[in-house]
């Protein structure tokens, strides 16, 4: 049923009215306003922005707008004792030092409180030693080094290029390899697109530009000192030694000018193959240590950052639902930035602001959504998704009973090529139907739908004529809602052409050069891509909050479950002899998936036919849809990752940004040939198949007729 039927509204107040109210010029104005000074989590500037947003959301017409504060562990450089890396000679003299700050962009030379590049939550330390180049520091890179090249990183300082995987995974891998320090750098191969000038003349990374970022391995814990519970005024805090996810070795990021100075002297083994070479004019030798003439020189890190419990502020706005006020649709994105946040997060925050304004306009004209909409401006996302996680921990009982959906709203753009969507399969049909109704902003697709341009530019690898929709991973504020609480979630943004641009993320990510001008000059001068993203995010929220029957299609979950079962089975079948020896069978999982498919099909038939004028039956059917995602939650969580509780999806253990399907089975199978005790290892595979099969079967039964 269409949204117009929701709450006795006049035809004017339908989805079209909401979408028509969204204006590119407003998004542009809001972005400018949000990006003139830094808004680092825990600072006065970010508190002031929180209060400004609270005030403006109230003006826009929300029913209530409150600040929710928490006292969480954050990390800052020491203002009087800067972090840097040096090359030292045999006498211990520093013969080269890395830069202490990024050269500020034009027009920002006099801005104060620009935090210098640092790796948030690095411990203090001054390790010195030989350097080992570890490529991207992925699991497979360390396998190559340790197993194939027999290079031992124990007691070494490793240098890794940013890209491919979340930086926290790089640090974890280095720690496990025995390294005593990590240097992270941006290689032009990954952060300098050919044929484009560096900022301020283009959108590429200059040699002095550096990517900031946290290096935690929280696995969904939130504040490291209060895992599982909100960091409120009566919180019990762990000691720092028991804190969750903190790195144990010093880490520091540098740009490619400084990296050149370190890498040009590298000796030892040659790179194993071309995939280990970047674009600098250096040999990309692996080491350990420097070559011939420089072999007595060492690298020394000087890290003096401190971890501090600091107050953060979320802004929570409420637009009460007229019919089902106890059902929540949440639109959330973060407000804190590393520096100016021109893309991350303010291109997203500006879109949320305009969505709130549009909803507020409709509300002032007498309209209300069917369900309650919650709007959130999260704090401290950059420090480990802390604001969203603490709020969800504080409100978990309400959310698990009332949460319909969560739509994430971080950066609206990471390119200007096509749409990118990651979401639960329950939302596939919603996204397809919505994008068919929206106009494409793309050149060459005038008068065509967004669905058409998206499908053409980013086709599904499985289904012809459909666009690619990816699995949810992590690295953003949907994590607690989806991976911990099992609330249906989705995210949308405009992205680059992944086939022609092999660099990781966008070049100026988390640098001082992520400014308003970057967006206005190079990415989206007309703010048409921002407007499209606002329409997608806002349209999803509108439909989720307003349609009589929730716009979830459980049959799409059945399809992907079969695909994921096939995939994990084929991985296991690379070990046919062991499967036979240890009697490993996937029959229970395939049987559960078959049952789910049949029950989902029957449920969908009932959904077409039931009496929608009967509020009890309507509520019952909607609750079955709402609670389906919840049914995939295992209260015990995944092995060693208690806050990742979704059995179908979890962030990859090797890359927090990526989603993995049937993660429990996947991790049990991963590198199983190198596990010393095959009986124990295959026993765990069998246990994980059992958990997955049970969970799928249990989820299927929630869709059965209730009596």
């Amino acid at each position: 049923k269409s949204s117009n039927e929701a709450t006795n509204i006049t035809p004017k107040h339908n989805m079209k009215a909401f979408l028509d109210e969204l204006k590119a010029e407003n998004i542009k104005k809001f972005l400018y306003n949000f990006t003139q000074i830094p808004h680092l989590a825990g600072t006065e500037q970010n508190f002031q922005l929180a209060k400004q947003i609270q005030s403006q959301w109230k003006e826009f017409g929300l029913d209530s707008v409150e600040l929710a504060h928490y006292d969480v562990l954050l990390s800052y450089p020491n203002k009087t004792h800067p972090n840097y890396i040096s090359i030292i000679n045999e006498d211990g003299n520093e013969i080269f030092n890395t830069s202490l700050f990024e050269p500020p962009p034009p027009g920002y030379e006099n801005v104060s409180d620009i935090v210098p590049p640092f790796s948030a939550f690095s411990p203090q330390g001054m390790p010195e030693g030989d350097l080992v180049y570890v490529n991207y520091a992925r699991t497979e890179d360390f396998f190559k080094l340790e197993r194939d090249m027999k290079i031992n990183c124990s007691g070494k300082i490793v240098i890794a290029r940013y890209g491919k995987v979340f930086r926290g995974n790089k640090v974890k891998n280095a720690q496990l390899a025995g390294a005593k320090g990590v240097i992270l750098y941006s290689d032009p191969a990954d952060y300098f697109a050919p044929g484009v000038k560096s900022y301020p003349d283009g959108w590429n990374l200059p040699g002095g530009g550096v990517q900031r970022g946290n290096i935690l391995n929280l696995n969904g814990a939130g504040d490291p000192l209060t895992p599982g519970y909100p960091a409120n005024e009566y919180a019990y805090r762990r000691g720092i030694a028991e804190a969750v996810g903190l790195p144990s070795i010093p880490v520091h990021p540098i740009g490619y000018y400084d990296a050149q100075k370190l890498l040009e002297k590298m000796g030892g083994s040659a790179p194993p193959d071309s995939s280990w070479r970047g674009s600098l004019k250096v040999p990309y030798n692996v080491g350990p240590g420097f070559t011939g003439n420089f072999s007595t020189q060492k690298v020394k890190m000087h890290i003096h950052s401190t971890n501090e419990v600091t107050r953060i502020y979320n802004v929570i706005g409420t637009l009460r639902g007229a019919v089902e006020p106890d059902r929540y649709v949440i639109l959330g994105g973060h407000r804190d930035s590393w520096v100016f946040g021109g893309i991350d997060p303010q291109s997203g925050a500006a879109v949320v602001h305009e969505i709130v304004r549009s909803f507020g306009t409709l509300k002032k004209e007498g309209w209300r959504p069917r369900r309650t909409i919650l709007f959130a401006s999260w704090d401290a996302e950059e420090f480990g998704l802390l604001g969203s996680t603490e709020w969800a921990e504080e409100n978990s009982r309400l959310l698990q009973e009332r949460g319909v959906a969560y739509i994430n709203a971080d950066s609206s753009i990471e390119g200007n090529y096509t749409l990118r969507v990651d979401c639960t399969p329950l939302m596939y049909s919603l996204v397809h139907n919505l994008t068919k109704e929206l106009k494409s902003p793309d050149e060459g697709f005038e008068g065509k739908s967004l669905y058409e341009s998206w499908t053409k530019k980013s086709p599904s690898p499985e289904f012809s004529g459909m666009p690619r929709i990816s699995k949810l991973g992590s690295g953003n504020d949907f994590e607690v809602f989806f991976q911990r609480l099992g609330i249906a979630s989705g995210r949308a943004r405009y992205t680059k052409n992944w086939e022609t641009n092999k660099f990781s993320g966008y070049p100026l990510y988390h640098s001082v050069y992520e400014t308003y001008e970057l967006v206005e000059k190079f990415y989206d001068p007309m703010f048409k891509y921002h407007l499209t993203v606002a329409q997608v995010r806002g349209g999803m929220v509108f439909e989720l909050a307003n349609s009589i029957v929730l716009p979830f299609d459980c049959r799409d979950y059945a399809v992907v479950l079969r695909k994921y079962a096939d995939k994990i089975y084929s991985i296991s079948m690379k070990h046919p002899q062991e499967m036979k020896t240890y009697s490993v069978s996937f029959d229970s999982l395939f049987s559960a998936v078959k049952n789910f498919t049949e029950i989902a099909s029957k449920f969908s038939e009932r959904l077409q036919d039931f009496d929608k004028s009967n509020p009890i039956v309507l509520r019952m059917m909607n609750d079955q849809l709402m609670f389906l995602e919840r049914a995939f939650i295992d209260p015990l969580g995944l092995p060693d990752r208690p806050f990742y509780r979704h059995v179908i999806y979890a962030p990859s253990s090797h890359n927090k940004y990526a989603g993995e399907s049937f993660p429990g089975i996947y991790d049990a199978l991963f590198d199983i040939e190198s596990k010393v005790d095959p009986s124990k290892a295959w026993g765990e595979v069998k246990r994980q198949i059992y958990v997955a099969a049970f969970t799928v079967q249990a989820a299927a039964e929630t869709l059965s007729e209730v009596a």
């Epitope: 194939d148 124990s154 025995g178 010393v676």
Partner: antibody, heavy 116, light 107 residues
């Protein structure tokens, strides 16, 4: 159940050659690194050589480098050790073992005696 | 190369005794230590890996401990079938070196 069966040992003169084989069963041989370890009569254990699952990477103890060659035929589930320029100090029981670093399953061994 | 030094080289004990064998590495080997049991004329068998993890089927009377450079294998209550030679091995870096062995004999 994992089984490793070495063969090819015997008496050989110094400077001579010998090729040891190890037939593997009970596991998916082509997925695993394999290792040769030897034990001189009445002495301790000595790691000799390792090979990667595809056979693309090989490693040797300094004492045998340049003289011994490890190889494998994954289609036949068989590991080999070609031993050239044999010396008296190469006399030992040669074991093939599954895995690398840590050896979870071993064959029963084959005795190589280098003597004139 | 990393040297592994075992002590004692032999010991005599009775059934039911608690037996401790130590192994010292010439440098820090982190958690890269395994222990093997070998009976005369037989191949070695893996007992303990990564310092303290018992391999499948190994009785609970066998335990491993230690860190850095000093490691211990303990048999809490010696059984008749435990009379054998025990080897420690470092697996941090190649060449993967073994201790010279500790022979456990019947008193």
């Amino acid at each position: 159940e994992v089984q490793l069966l070495e063969s090819g040992g015997g008496l050989v003169q110094p400077g001579g050659s010998l090729r040891l084989s190890c037939a593997a069963s009970g596991f998916t041989f082509g997925n695993y690194r394999m290792t040769w370890v030897r034990q001189a009569p009445g002495k301790g254990l000595e790691w000799v050589s390792e090979i990667s699952p595809s056979g693309g990477y090989t490693y040797y103890a300094d004492s045998v480098k340049g003289r011994f060659t490890i190889s494998r035929d994954n289609s036949k589930n068989t590991l080999y050790l070609q031993m050239n320029s044999l010396r008296a100090e190469d006399t030992a029981v040669y074991y093939c073992a599954k895995g690398f670093r840590i050896f979870d399953y071993w064959g029963q061994g084959t005795l190589v005696t280098v003597s004139s | 190369d990393i040297q592994m030094t075992q002590s004692p080289s032999s010991l005599s004990a009775s059934v039911g005794d608690r037996v401790t064998i130590t192994c010292r590495a010439s440098q820090d080997v982190s958690s890269g230590v395994a222990w093997y049991q070998q009976k005369p004329g037989k191949a070695p068998k893996l007992l303990i890996y990564k310092v303290s993890n018992r391999f499948s089927g190994v009785p609970s009377r066998f335990s491993g401990s230690g860190s850095g450079t000093d490691f211990t294998l303990t048999i809490s209550s010696l059984q008749p079938e435990d009379f054998a030679t025990y080897y420690c091995q470092q697996n941090l870096a190649p060449p993967y070196t073994f201790g010279q062995g500790t022979k456990v004999e019947i008193k």
